[in-house]
């Protein structure tokens, strides 16, 4: 988790002088509770936006927007703490809006936005906006939280972001898999424009089951520059197991920008259609 590096972060708007500060996620009002505290944010919304850094890189960001309730507690509102929590790692990043002038009611509802938290593709977050000062112990909560899901690199807009392109999102291997005689598969795919090696991971399954019955890994050495964008053809030998007929072929590249964590592409070969002829019924029943 990090903040987008460009421009001084601003939260001022007409009628309010405001500055954005880094925060430890532990506001002073937790330690020194105040008697009068503001009500919670209203209509918190989190959306996926995209923003460029000064270097021109494009990143997904969490666009956070909320409004204030139209009650007298805005007289005691000193700012807001914005927190983004990555759900699995428990990594948290916070910033604080510090109001340098008192808020006053005006003809339209106060609205705040912040779009500088950089988020990662395919990750899950909880976004919280706390109004400051925070409530006294056992006081009514004055925060709102929402969960937020960032799409993976297959999403059209995500595909062209810097983190996705770095993991190979623009590479389309156009995998074809052909079943040959003598328990073989021919796998064909388009190489990318980088001299890096690939792995083909073959996993076979019985019809309608998800437990694998055969696994095989095939290494493809790094292509020479004249082979870039060419088709690579590989023949894989299957284990002769009756019913082990559904094959998933996954191609894992090892691009320099993403190493072991590059996007994988896969193709599946289904089991052949069963003929509709009913099985003959035996004229005796076995005893076991």
């Amino acid at each position: 988790l990090r903040l987008l590096d460009h421009r001084a972060l601003v939260c001022s708007q007409p009628g309010l002088n405001c500055t954005v500060k880094n925060s430890t996620c532990l506001d002073d009002s937790w330690i020194h509770p105040r008697n009068l505290t503001p009500s919670s944010p209203k209509d918190l919304q989190i959306q996926l936006h995209f923003a460029h850094t000064q270097q021109g890189d494009l990143f997904p960001v969490a666009h956070i927007e909320w409004t204030l309730q139209t009650d007298a507690s805005i007289l005691y509102l000193e700012g807001a703490e914005l927190s983004v929590l990555q759900l699995n790692t428990n990594e948290r990043l916070c910033v604080r809006f510090e109001f340098l002038s008192k808020l006053r009611h005006h003809h339209r509802r106060w609205r705040f936005t912040f779009s500088h938290f950089v988020v990662d593709p395919d990750q899950e977050y909880e976004v919280t906006v706390h109004h400051l000062p925070k409530p006294i112990p056992d006081g009514d909560p004055n925060h709102q939280s929402k969960n937020f899901l960032v799409p993976d690199c297959e999403h059209a807009r995500m595909k062209v972001t810097t983190p996705c392109m770095s993991s190979g999102s623009l590479w389309d291997p156009n995998i074809t898999v052909e079943t040959l005689e003598a328990h073989q598969l021919r796998v064909s795919f388009t190489l990318w424009n980088e001299s890096t090696h690939y792995q083909i991971l073959l996993t076979s399954f019985p019809h309608m089951e998800n437990h694998s019955c055969f696994e095989h890994m095939h290494h493809i050495p790094a292509p020479r520059p004249e082979e870039f964008h060419q088709r690579s053809n590989v023949t894989l030998t299957l284990r002769n197991l009756k019913g082990c007929c559904r094959h998933q072929v996954q191609i894992q590249p090892f691009f320099s920008s993403c190493l072991n964590d590059c996007l994988r592409h896969s193709a599946t070969v289904s089991c052949p259609e069963m003929p509709d002829t009913p099985e003959p019924i035996p004229d005796y029943m076995p005893l076991w």
Epitope: Q45, I46, Q47, L87, N88, T89, N90, E124, S145, K146, N147, F148, L149, P151
Partner: antibody, heavy 116, light 107 residues
């Protein structure tokens, strides 16, 4: 190939506890949380909570707080869900699923029958 | 907790039909909604996440739309393997909650 393989069916008496395991493979276990969802016979899906496989933090549905414990063993890439003080209405198929908000891979389910 | 209501409770359709299933949240979840398919005796399978994003490996005949409180799952041309129960699930607010499910049956 991402796979979540759960432990086998269990029959328990009311008041007892059950511990269901969920072994993950095919991805970095610590990179994605594990959620637990149950389904009573002929009923819909009910979210029980989730555990961070990275930090061990948990988030339980209020209904199960005090009665459920979710844990992980990163050395074996296994998540566990223990439910205590079982009642007959806890009879259900218990599923583990990868991730927290978007449950993209599921275990095959573990049937827990609570009967005296 | 946010209530998720799916309609109709069940529907009958034929192979090749265009099928639309709806899901309504008791309050706005913006785009925080997933769709799952479940066949008898099997675990659910994620189809759509974030209201409209197709999960990797899911056929393109499935699509999702909507935001706020009203969402739709559409199957453009129903296939024999699509006869199943479909659940929506919101994830914007804790706790996560599921709809009651809609069974799509053969007419």
């Amino acid at each position: 190939q991402v796979q979540l393989v759960q432990s086998g069916a269990e029959v328990k008496k009311p008041g007892a506890s059950v511990k269901v395991s969920c072994k993950a493979s095919g991805y970095g276990f610590a990179s994605r949380g594990i959620s637990w969802v149950r389904q009573a016979p002929g009923q819909g899906l009910e979210w029980m909570g989730w555990i961070s496989t990275y930090s061990g933090n948990t988030n339980y549905a209020k209904k199960f707080e005090g009665r459920v414990t979710m844990t992980t063993d990163t050395s074996t890439s296994t998540a566990y869900m223990e439910l205590r003080s079982l009642r007959s209405d806890d009879t259900a198929v218990y599923y583990c699923a990868r991730r927290v908000l978007r449950l993209d891979y599921w275990g095959q389910g573990t049937l827990v029958t609570v009967s005296s | 907790d946010i209530q998720m209501t799916q309609s109709p409770s069940s529907l009958s359709a034929s192979v090749g039909d265009r099928v639309t299933i709806t899901c309504r949240a008791s309050q706005s979840v913006h785009t925080g909604l997933n769709w799952y398919q479940q066949k008898p005796g099997k675990a659910p399978k994620l189809l759509i996440y974030g209201a409209s994003n197709l999960q990797s490996g899911v056929p393109s005949r499935f699509s999702g739309s909507g935001s706020g409180t009203d969402f739709t799952l559409t199957i453009s041309s129903l296939q024999p393997e699509d006869f199943a129960t479909y659940y929506c699930q919101q994830f914007e607010h804790n706790p996560l909650t599921f709809g009651q499910g809609i069974k799509v049956e053969i007419k």
